[in-house]
């Protein structure tokens, strides 16, 4: 999906209002310095591409993020403010359902959500030069 035509300011507002709080809740009890940010993004569409991938695509050691509260709200925000997004996700969801495991917060999941927090922070500061 090409995120170029999304309403970035509304997605940012939804993130600041509630999605960010849900990410913090998920990470509660984890030190902010515990994980190094290894995933980066260069502009808002690229950030949303990476956010969508890390949130909804199962990875080795972490197959359960798609059912978390922050994921549900992220899906809603992208569907509402990115034209045509929900229509593109049908195949992705079927694959996700097959890969879904029991909902367990593993260290790998915590690391992945830490990466997500970094991507969202970068999404909110699009004018900053890439480090």
């Amino acid at each position: 999906y090409d995120f170029t035509n999304c309403d970035f300011e509304k997605i940012k507002a939804a993130y600041l209002s509630t999605i960010s709080k849900d990410l913090i809740t998920y990470m509660s009890g984890t030190k902010s310095t515990e994980f190094n940010n290894t995933v980066s993004c260069s502009n808002r569409p690229h950030c949303l591409t990476e956010i969508q991938s890390l949130t909804f695509n199962p990875t080795a050691g972490c197959a359960s993020l798609a059912k978390e509260m922050f994921a549900m709200k992220t899906k809603a925000a992208l569907a509402i403010w990115c034209p045509g997004y929900s229509e593109t996700q049908i195949n992705a969801t079927q694959a996700m359902k097959k890969a879904r495991k029991s909902k367990v917060t593993t260290n790998k999941c915590l690391e992945q959500v830490s990466q997500l927090q970094g991507l969202w922070r970068r999404f909110n500061r699009p004018l900053l030069k890439q480090q």
């Epitope: 209002s17 849900d22 509260m69 709200k73 509402i80 996700q89 049908i90």
Partner: antibody, heavy 122, light 108 residues
Framework: EVQLVQSGAEVKKPGESLKISCKSS????????INWVRQMPGKGLEWMGQ????????TYNGNFKGQVTISADKSISTAYLQWSSLKASDTAMYYC???????????????WGQGTTVTVSS | EIVMTQSPATLSVSPGERATLSCSVS???????LHWYQQKPGQSPRPWIF???NLASGIPARFSGSGSGTEFTLTISSLQSEDFAVYYC?????????FGGGTKVEIK
């Protein structure tokens, strides 16, 4: 104008099957989660589960998982709640509710259907 | 599961008086994930307050919400006849979504 219109009241016998509906209009149906909420006579509200019509993704309250099935038909902008074998304890009012971001970007159930009364009695 | 406990179950108030409704949450949640709904007999619930303190569209300013963590409050500064109803708090912090048992505000 956003509207959720639910199917009419139902009277059923224990063991029978039932499918009630919630037809949406006035917004992009595929892009918003639809929730189902139960209210037993004289009692409070209980969240049963939700569906994202865009891809059919569902999340259930564990208390209702296996008891009901939530589905949706995008082509007619309608969500469904169904039972394969009703019990007397399923007697209740059932509401569908859309969830979305309000003007302050808080996420909540912002529009509700009028409710469907289901009575199960022998 | 997050348990929402509302008190009192019934609040008897005279028109013009102040009403304070409480919602206690079993584990701390973000204020952005606490909402209030109003329900009148024979009607569907209506969104009333979003994110602890933000009034839904068209809700009069005599209503206010406050709180954080595990304790939240809905206050009606001067009750009008149309305010008599049941009010439910609800959390959108973790699954399953849960509602409080409701507080019925009735005429004294």
């Amino acid at each position: 104008e956003v509207q959720l219109v639910q199917s009419g009241a139902e009277v059923k016998k224990p063991g029978e099957s039932l499918k009630i509906s919630c037809k949406s209009s006035g917004y992009a149906f595929s892009s918003y989660w639809i929730n189902w909420v139960r209210q037993m006579p004289g009692k409070g509200l209980e969240w049963m589960g939700q569906i994202f019509p865009g891809d059919g993704d569902t999340t259930y309250n564990g208390n209702f998982k296996g008891q009901v099935t939530i589905s949706a038909d995008k082509s007619i902008s309608t969500a469904y709640l169904q039972w394969s074998s009703l019990k007397a304890s399923d007697t209740a009012m059932y509401y569908c509710a859309r969830s979305g971001f309000d003007y302050g970007y808080f996420y909540a159930m912002d529009y509700w259907g009028q409710g469907t009364t289901v009575t199960v009695s022998s | 599961e997050i348990v929402m406990t509302q008190s009192p179950a019934t609040l008897s108030v005279s028109p013009g008086e102040r009403a304070t409704l409480s919602c206690s949450v079993s584990s701390s949640i973000s204020s952005s994930n606490l909402h209030w709904y109003q329900q009148k007999p024979g009607q569907s619930p209506r969104p009333w307050i979003f994110g602890t303190s933000n009034l839904a569209s068209g809700i009069p300013a005599r209503f206010s919400g406050s709180g954080s963590g595990t304790e939240f409050t809905l206050t009606i500064s001067s009750l009008q006849s149309e305010d008599f109803a049941v009010y439910y708090c609800q959390q959108w912090s973790s699954y399953p979504l849960t509602f409080g048992g409701g507080t019925k505000v009735e005429i004294k």
